[in-house]
Amino acid sequence: EAHKSEIAHRYNDLGEQHFKGLVLIAFSQYLQKCSYDEHAKLVQEVTDFAKTCVADESAANCDKSLHTLFGDKLCAIPNLRENYGELADCCTKQEPERNECFLQHKDDNPSLPPFERPEAEAMCTSFKENPTTFMGHYLHEVARRHPYFYAPELLYYAEQYNEILTQCCAEADKESCLTPKLDGVKEKALVSSVRQRMKCSSMQKFGERAFKAWAVARLSQTFPNADFAEITKLATDLTKVNKECCHGDLLECADDRAELAKYMCENQATISSKLQTCCDKPLLKKAHCLSEVEHDTMPADLPAIAADFVEDQEVCKNYAEAKDVFLGTFLYEYSRRHPDYSVSLLLRLAKKYEATLEKCCAEANPPACYGTVLAEFQPLVEEPKNLVKTNCDLYEKLGEYGFQNAILVRYTQKAPQVSTPTLVEAARNLGRVGTKCCTLPEDQRLPCVEDYLSAILNRVCLLHEKTPVSEHVTKCCSGSLVERRPCFSALTVDETYVPKEFKAETFTFHSDICTLPEKEKQIKKQTALAELVKHKPKATAEQLKTVMDDFAQFLDTCCKAADKDTCFSTEGPNLVTRCKDALA
């Protein structure tokens, strides 16, 4: 229904707290360099204006679109050109081009320092002094570093943060209460960020149809008892919600997501038997819970998929009649039978089925042609199954850090032109798949591994797009989203690469490394490992292991030495010489 004032409508629907949080997220995601105070001032102005529109929807400017209102606010910021360069040119455009321009200038890798968590005492003091400002800072800092973070979900994480601080700041040992809990939230939020970025990439590069196919597969796996019409309705609504969030329409997105959660809870009987626990929770927790609810029990009497999609005489007629509906039905039926497959795999199978029908239905004897299609799925299914087995075996043998190193070597060989920080970040993230997925029951491993890897590789592609350096990466990133992971997996050593010359300073370390947190130490060592591979792309695993063991021993010895500086300056050059010899 049309509202006289869009801003008043959203303020009324969302309530002041969520309204302000979402506006803050929106501004922080668009203008990533502005300080919290600058954004907080704008948010207050927008909120005050919204309240005047609630009081009188006919008041001046209350009928303007949200993009117009928000865009005008952003364009009124002083020193916009000095701070943001060509982003300021967006302000010369009219809506909707102006918003599109803002979206194009979102930076997936802003040059901001890592978000450092203050020590427990300081955190609790500022939280107690002003919880609202404290949480505002959290929203601002996360949103500007993750410009596509799913806004209503970020409100959920802020709420989690709030609850943890409320609980732990009352404890005697605040630090040991806060650290594991906040680490847990951070880990989940980071995964949520890359997953959502993947959804926005799907929407931006391949349109709503591609995202809707993803949603149909995912929802069919989770709700195998819902009929196709129900799944289609949920997928359509979910597509709208995600389109809005990816497009910067955060108020509409959060509002529609709340509506979708409400619909699901009111229609549990036709969707799933597993929703009640989620539906008993308050809004943010409810929507989050529904987004990761466990799969419903599969119906016991599902007929074989071949009946309708291979053996039926009407296959080509049904396909001709309504291609998208027929393929959608295939994806629904296949996905509800396979909660043990990744969504990426299910979409590859649907694509293979579509290609088979395109080819076969044009032949004189289609049934003879498409009759073997299900058998042709086998290699497509085996490939990711083997990937999971191989990688989980390796993870179990090496542990997370060793597994990350193995991936780092592999990916540096595949794309040695990519910057070392990007390779290290990617390998660390890809390596976490072991901890995240390899400990799960067998039937949950494949979906966990492949869909997580796809999201991480999407980030690799986004970073590479900014400064393309590797033909290998460009090739894999320019294909369809669901083919990316198999493409990266199939890459081998880049034979075109001219090895980097050996620079001693790259492998020269100082005593300051000894006081670094374990994570930072690992990153330093992994940086050195990537550089070694760039110097010797064809070094054997054995050679690299020898060098890295020597390196670890050197660090251990010098960090335990009475005179660390002297140890580093005398033993360091010896290490470099040994490394060169080992790799010769």
Partner: nanobody, 115 residues
Framework: EVQLLESGGGLVQPGGSLRLSCAAS????????MSWVRQAPGKGLEWVSS????????LYADSVKGRFTISRDNSKNTLYLQMNSLRPEDTAVYYC????????SSQGTLVTVSS
């Protein structure tokens, strides 16, 4: 919506000829193989002939081979069946179908071969 409309049937003497047409709409005609099937009075459906989307590949039932010719005009979205040397056992309702479907989703056209 897919629509198939057959025409050209009628009464013909043994040894005579007929040309059946099938006008198609509601789908990309050239992307689909098409078939003719028939149903004689009191019998089940029988496949007669098929043609690929491009028209380059054709198949015939043994009972009509050498007598019937299937063809198509993709610019007119039309399928044809040229029937020569007709026999009494060719009497049936003829249907055009998409792909290899052995089913009736249209009205069909009646061919009667009788002296």
């Amino acid at each position: 919506e897919v629509q198939l409309l057959e025409s050209g049937g009628g009464l013909v003497q043994p040894g005579g000829s007929l040309r059946l047409s099938c006008a198609a709409s509601g789908f990309v005609f050239s992307s689909f193989g098409m078939s003719w099937v028939r149903q004689a009075p009191g019998k089940g459906l029988e496949w007669v002939s098929s043609i690929s989307g491009s028209g380059s590949d054709t198949l015939y039932a043994d009972s009509v081979k050498g007598r019937f010719t299937i063809s198509r005009d993709n610019s007119k979205n039309t399928l044809y069946l040229q029937m020569n040397s007709l026999r009494p056992e060719d009497t049936a309702v003829y249907y055009c179908t998409i792909g290899g479907s052995l089913s009736r989703s249209s009205q069909g056209t009646l061919v009667t071969v009788s002296s």
